[in-house]
């Protein structure tokens, strides 16, 4: 792992100047785990749609990694497995929560943040502009 | 509305044994506004594998309004408009962090926690298991 | 149904403050934002400042940065604005807009103002 | 901060008319764009958000297009209730900002 050194200009989490802060506590609790196991899937490649998934790494965040889908045609792949290009393949976005360390490399004070993702690919029909 | 009492037992903020705790900056920063301008899609009704958007509330998380999709359909729509059973339509999942109340109605005090959403549907190529 | 209730007119001196409430119905008011809008006489909307109730932070238009407070008390779904050093150029209609506050999810996120109150007519003059 | 510009500033129409109100941003801004009606002495009211999207009890006739920096509000076969005041409001960044208002009256 990257070793990250401690920000001397660290925050002191009783610092009652600290902006808008609270308390967090990261010992993630999964919801996932009884009711949904998360099977590896293999949609990315089985799709008419299908996607590569591009590791997106930054030690400052959390999560650090986030994988991100990029459609890999810009069309769709027809049942005999070539592209028709008379569909389009287009990603589906989701706005995500993180935490940045804030100030960075700071190990105890974090700040939120919205990020936009790819999460995967989906076959459209197009939208045909006509020219009048 | 609901009228949410606030929790007497809600842990200090300077509490040293809140477990794995850290500080953290709630004036949520937007980094998609700079790069990426969010443009909104009816790809959920334009998509071979369509889906319908549920709304899932909780009060007690953040963000406490997510939108869940249901894939409509088991097949997927094909050149002609109806139903194609030799593909599958399955959601897209993603595993998410939100922050919840911990204890409940406690306005300072969190536990982060991830859960899996369907963002959207894919279309795919079912997996068939030949009988020997 | 949601309804966003507003406190009376108020009449103030230059230099004084004023508090307008703001108090919801219907909804789970933690889930949603409040922001403040303002219209003068025969002008158009102008944006103040709004909050994020759950975690009961605020933003605010740099004009009104340092002026204005805007606070919310989950325990009787009301939220507040606070001006203070007002002159005759704050006499105004002040609103409460309810904002969804929802994450973008390819199709929209809800950040527009669904609900408004029926506004606080705020005069000031000595 | 984003400058919203609409025209016409005002516009005087005949009732079962076609209204069109552009609404134009200083600066992309997706479709974080909405549409509000204000009426004399009341509160303004969601007509479409994201540039495109219908309220539930807003009349089908009002519809909204655009994404970036154009955008534009159709009223399709005006009616006499639709006299008022129309602003376009973008959310894309902080501070929210909306159009100067355009003022829409029946002949």
């Known amino acids: 792992g990257i070793t990250i050194p401690r920000n001397p200009g660290c925050p002191n989490s009783e610092d009652k100047n600290f902006p808008r802060t609270v308390m967090v506590n990261l010992n993630i609790h999964n919801r996932n785990t009884n009711t949904n196991p998360k099977r590896s899937s293999d949609y990315y490649n089985r799709s008419t749609s299908p996607w590569n998934l591009h590791r997106n790494e930054d030690p400052e965040r959390y999560p650090s990694v986030i994988w991100e889908a990029k459609c890999r045609h810009l069309g769709c792949i027809n049942a005999d497995g070539n592209v028709d290009y008379h569909m389009n393949s287009v990603p589906i976005q989701q706005e995500i929560l993180v935490l940045r360390r804030e100030p960075p490399h700071c190990p105890n004070s974090f700040r939120l943040e919205k990020i936009l993702v790819s999460v995967g690919c989906t076959c459209v029909t197009p939208i045909v502009h006509h020219v009048a | 509305g609901i009228t949410i009492p606030r929790n007497p037992g809600c842990p200090n903020s300077e509490d040293k044994n809140f477990p794995r705790t850290v500080m953290v900056n709630l004036n949520i920063h937007n980094r998609n506004t700079n790069t990426n301008p969010k443009r909104s899609s009816d790809y959920y009704n334009r998509s071979t594998s369509p889906w319908n958007l549920h709304r899932n509330e909780d009060p007690e998380r953040y963000p406490s309004v997510i939108w869940e999709a249901k894939c409509r359909h088991l097949g997927c729509i094909n050149a002609d408009g109806n139903v194609d059973y030799h593909m599958n339509s399955v959601p897209i999942q993603q595993e998410i962090l939100v922050l919840r109340r911990e204890p409940p109605h406690c306005p300072n005090s969190f536990r982060l926690e991830k859960i899996l959403v369907s963002v959207g549907c894919t279309c795919v190529t079912p997996i068939v298991h030949h009988v020997a | 149904e949601v309804q966003l209730v507003q406190s009376g007119a108020e009449v103030k001196k230059p230099g004084e403050s004023v508090k307008i409430s703001c108090k919801a119905s219907?909804?789970?008011?933690?889930?949603?934002?409040i922001s403040w809008v303002r219209q003068a006489p025969g002008q158009g909307l102008e944006w103040m400042g709004g909050?994020?109730?759950?975690?009961?932070?605020?933003d605010y238009a740099q004009k009104f940065q340092g002026r204005v407070t805007i606070t919310a008390d989950e325990s009787t779904t009301t939220a507040y604005m606070e001006l203070s050093g007002l002159t005759s150029d704050d006499t105004a209609v002040y609103y409460c807009?309810?904002?969804?506050?929802?994450?973008?999810?390819?199709?929209?996120?809800?950040?527009?103002?669904?609900?408004w109150g029926q506004g606080t007519t705020v005069t000031v003059s000595s | 901060e984003i400058v919203l510009t609409q025209s016409p500033d005002f516009q005087s129409v005949t009732p079962k008319e076609k209204v069109t109100i552009t609404c134009r941003a200083s600066?992309?801004?997706?479709?974080?764009l909405h549409w509000y009606q204000q009426k004399p002495d009341q509160s303004p009211k969601l007509l479409i958000k994201?540039?495109?999207h219908s309220i539930s009890g807003v009349p089908s006739r009002f519809s909204g297009s655009g994404s970036g920096t154009d955008f534009t509000l159709t009223i399709n076969s005006l009616e006499a209730e639709d006299a008022g005041t129309y602003y376009c409001?973008?959310?894309?960044?902080?501070?929210?900002?909306f159009g100067q208002g355009t003022k829409v009256d029946i002949k």
């Open positions: 409001h973008q959310s894309y960044w902080l501070p929210n900002t």
């Open positions: 219907g909804g789970s008011f933690s889930s949603y934002g």
């Open positions: 600066q992309d801004i997706g479709s974080e």
């Open positions: 807009a309810r904002v969804p506050n929802e994450f973008w999810n390819g199709y929209y996120a809800t950040q527009d103002f669904d609900y």
């Open positions: 994201y540039a495109s």
């Open positions: 909050i994020t109730v759950f975690f009961g932070t605020a």
